[in-house]
Interface confidence: low
């Protein structure tokens, strides 16, 4: 039985040109995390494998940085970065847990939501 839950940063906002941290946390389970995938719609952004470490998809490597922790840092944000992001936790023996984050990219400096996850 899958008892775990994913906590995420939820709906967050950031300014165009800025950076943001996408963060998920798996709790309430003793399952072993073997891999975490970060995906945007149908695109794979990054993989953090428990054994092999971080790998950023080559098409994103200039703007995506691993961490902190199992999170993902997006840099030089553009309006095209707005939308849904998914953290997919592969665990043994539970299986897969998925968390969803919605990112809004603002033209102006009114990104008040989720400010504690934003990088100055």
């Amino acid at each position: 039985m899958m008892t775990g839950t994913i906590e995420t940063t939820g709906n967050i906002s950031a300014e165009k040109g800025g950076s943001i941290i996408l963060q998920c946390h798996l709790s309430s389970t003793t399952a072993q995390v073997t891999q975490v995938n970060w995906e945007q719609q149908d695109q794979l952004l990054a993989i953090c494998n428990a054994d092999l470490g971080w790998h950023i998809s080559p098409s994103f490597k200039d703007r995506v940085a691993p961490g902190p922790g199992l999170g993902l840092t997006l840099q030089s944000l553009t309006v095209n970065d707005a939308g849904e992001y998914f953290c997919i936790y592969h665990t043994y023996p539970d299986g897969t847990y998925t968390g969803r984050i919605f990112l809004e990219v603002l033209e102006s400096s009114v990104a008040e939501h989720g400010a504690r996850f934003q990088i100055p």
Epitope: T34, N49, D51, L52, S57, P58, I88, G95
Partner: antibody, heavy 120, light 108 residues
Amino acid sequence: QVQLVQSGAEVKKPGASVKVSCKASGYTFTSYGISWVRQAPGQGLEWMGWISAYNGNTNYAQKLQGRVTMTTDTSTSTAYMELRSLRSDDTAVYYCARAGWEQQLGFDYWGQGTLVTVSS
Amino acid sequence: AIQLTQSPSSLSASVGDRVTITCRASQSISSYLNWYQQKPGKAPKLLIYAASSLQSGVPSRFSGSGSGTDFTLTISSLQPEDFATYYCQQSYSTLAITFGQGTRLEIK
């Protein structure tokens, strides 16, 4: 274009070691992993393990642990697979393959294969 | 390790036929399932990744579907160059990647 070029065929005696090379070109070597897959005559594909060209971390198939070592030389974009204590059932074609992160670890490019024959 | 079972092990078909090969995983692997084609004496070639995504350069007559434990590779209209052996591979358990046993597609 992406190419993986492997070393030539080898004939070895039981108990000996073999080291197969795989020279990559046409892409950023450190942005991908290299897997090794073997195929005994008339048989299916068997995954042997892989190495991250990014950080050198390895993961080996359980049945080969202790006998196989995978390494990379980033200065020459070359991956190596060494198999020790060879037995007759190690006779196979050995392939290196690039692990495509965007392909969710599908092996998107393969070497031409290296036939290793173990015979007394 | 996660086991992959392909069916059938072999099949005969004619040019123009629609062919379906299935791959069943011993546990749920989400969409971490890839399909390969291998011709005699040649290295395998990636056809489908992530269960349903067509690899660049692969003809559109190849398609993949499925999620969880049951997956399908379909060739909509067989061409002479499609006669080969097909393998599924899971990359869900990246610490123990496994292949199916293969399906040999022969000319009827």
